[in-house]
């Protein structure tokens, strides 16, 4: 990811910029953007970044608001890179089963599951 | 999700079945399946279930191993439903920003981020 700062620092800075520019961003009161119904955020990265694209096109650019959208673009690049890493390594069945067990374990303990 | 038991119970049962049938499942020592490199599992659901499909096609069916793959199929249906819910509600910008802030907050605190 082509950025001088680590992704974790980038996320922190983006949170601060989002807070700073909130008033400017909500100026368009008629615009509609998809908001996921649940809190399993990682399942919705595509829609989240589509929403960011819509918001960017409707926001007057300049100053640090540009920095906010640049950061969000870098975060998208990082996530796209992570998605590529889902299928790059083909390994033995026992290693796949370890990962599947871990996935189901996380789903069991951390996901917000509605019946 | 068309199942008589809640998804949370389904996940628990699947974990138990996975443990029970592990020896049978790893019998094919030549089979190679994509295993994600990182622990942000939700980003990799597509690859995980493709891997399950590959494994199922290579496994002799019958008894409770069939139940395992049926459960995994129901879990996939649940996740597909959750993915649909990412874009069904198109709301005002302020509600989108709340979700974006929450997403970045979770990314900041819970994701396993490599620089």
């Amino acid at each position: 990811i082509p950025t001088e700062i680590p992704t974790s620092a980038l996320v922190k800075e983006t949170l601060a910029l989002l807070s700073t520019h909130r008033t400017l961003l909500i100026a368009n009161e008629t615009l509609r953007i998809p908001v996921p119904v649940h809190k399993n955020h990682q399942l919705c990265t595509e829609e989240i970044f589509q929403g960011i694209g819509t918001l960017e096109s409707q926001t007057v650019q300049g100053g640090t608001v540009e920095r906010l959208f640049k950061n969000l673009s870098l975060i998208k690049k990082y996530i796209d890179g992570q998605k590529k890493k889902c299928g790059e390594e083909r390994r033995r069945v026992n290693q796949f089963l370890d990962y599947l067990q871990e996935f189901l374990g996380v789903m069991n303990t951390e996901w917000i599951i509605e019946s | 999700i068309p199942t008589e038991i809640p998804t949370s119970a389904l996940v628990k049962e699947t974990l138990a079945l996975l443990s029970t049938h592990r020896t049978l499942l790893i019998a094919n020592e030549t089979l190679r399946i994509p295993v994600p490199v990182h622990k942000n599992h939700q980003l990799c659901t597509e690859e995980i279930f493709q891997g399950i499909g590959t494994l199922e096609s290579q496994t002799v069916q019958g008894g409770t191993v069939e139940r395992l793959f049926k459960n995994l199929s129901l879990i996939k249906k649940y996740i597909d439903g959750q993915k649909k819910k990412c874009g069904e509600e198109r709301r005002r910008v302020n509600q989108f920003l709340d979700y974006l802030q929450e997403f970045l907050g979770v990314m900041n605190t819970e994701w396993i981020i490599e620089s």
Partner: antibody, heavy 115, light 113 residues
């Protein structure tokens, strides 16, 4: 199957309020939003407002000051209340489920405002 | 508010004919983020609520016959019925699903010749 059933009065006195209940089946109000739309010969179809799956609301600015939408998800009921009705509020009032757009509609409640 | 203008206001047709009705919006209904046109079409028969036919300008709702086709982008949209059946006689409404408030056209009434 998905159904929305409406109940409410047919006749309302001028300056009084209108209350309609929309009872849904075949889906959960924690997963889907519900819109309210009215239809009159003079003004055609008019969108009034929506209550989202999470409980937040959005209203048409024209009706905001006298409209309230709430719900009891455990009873699968959505409540619509409009204050200070005048003769030009005579219309058929509909509730409709949100899934991207308004995919299922109630049968409608015909409301006449007259003394 | 986005104004939706439908034309014609009524159409007289014979069974089996191809029918085209138009809907024009006062602002573009194309969203840059998802590159989708947020427009829906509904059919309403007398004494019934509207029924969803098309959303996203061209996506047919499940169970809707394939003789109904939605097309268009930006501000100009079309609903085509390739071979009109007797049960298609109704009023057809387009709806802006792009921005709040959601707004509807005045309708196109499909009548039998």
């Amino acid at each position: 199957q998905v159904q929305l059933r409406q109940s409410g009065p047919g006749l309302v006195q001028p300056s009084q309020s209108l209350s309609i209940t929309c009872t849904v089946s075949g889906f959960s109000l924690t997963s889907y939003g519900v819109h309210w739309v009215r239809q009159s010969p003079g003004k055609g179809l008019e969108w009034l407002g929506v209550i989202w799956s999470g409980g937040s609301t959005d209203y048409n600015a024209v009706f905001m000051s006298r409209l309230s939408i709430s719900k009891d998800s455990s009873k699968s009921q959505v409540f619509f209340k409009m204050n200070s009705l005048q003769t030009d509020d005579t219309a058929i009032y509909y509730c409709a489920r949100n899934r991207y757009v308004l995919d299922y509609w109630g049968q409608g409640t015909s409301v006449t405002v007259s003394s | 508010d986005i104004v939706m203008t439908q034309s014609p206001s009524s159409l007289s047709v014979s069974a089996g004919e191809r029918v085209t009705m138009r809907c024009k919006s006062s602002q573009s209904l194309l969203t840059s983020g998802d590159q989708k046109n947020h427009l829906a079409w509904y059919q309403q028969k007398p004494g019934q609520p509207p029924k969803l036919l098309i959303y996203g300008a061209s996506t047919r709702e499940s169970g809707v016959p394939d003789r109904f086709t939605g097309s268009g982008s930006g501000t100009d949209f079309t609903l085509t019925i390739t071979s009109v059946q007797a049960e298609d006689l109704a009023v057809y409404y387009c709806q802006n699903d792009h921005s709040f408030p959601l707004t509807f056209g005045a309708g196109t009434k499909l009548e039998l010749k």
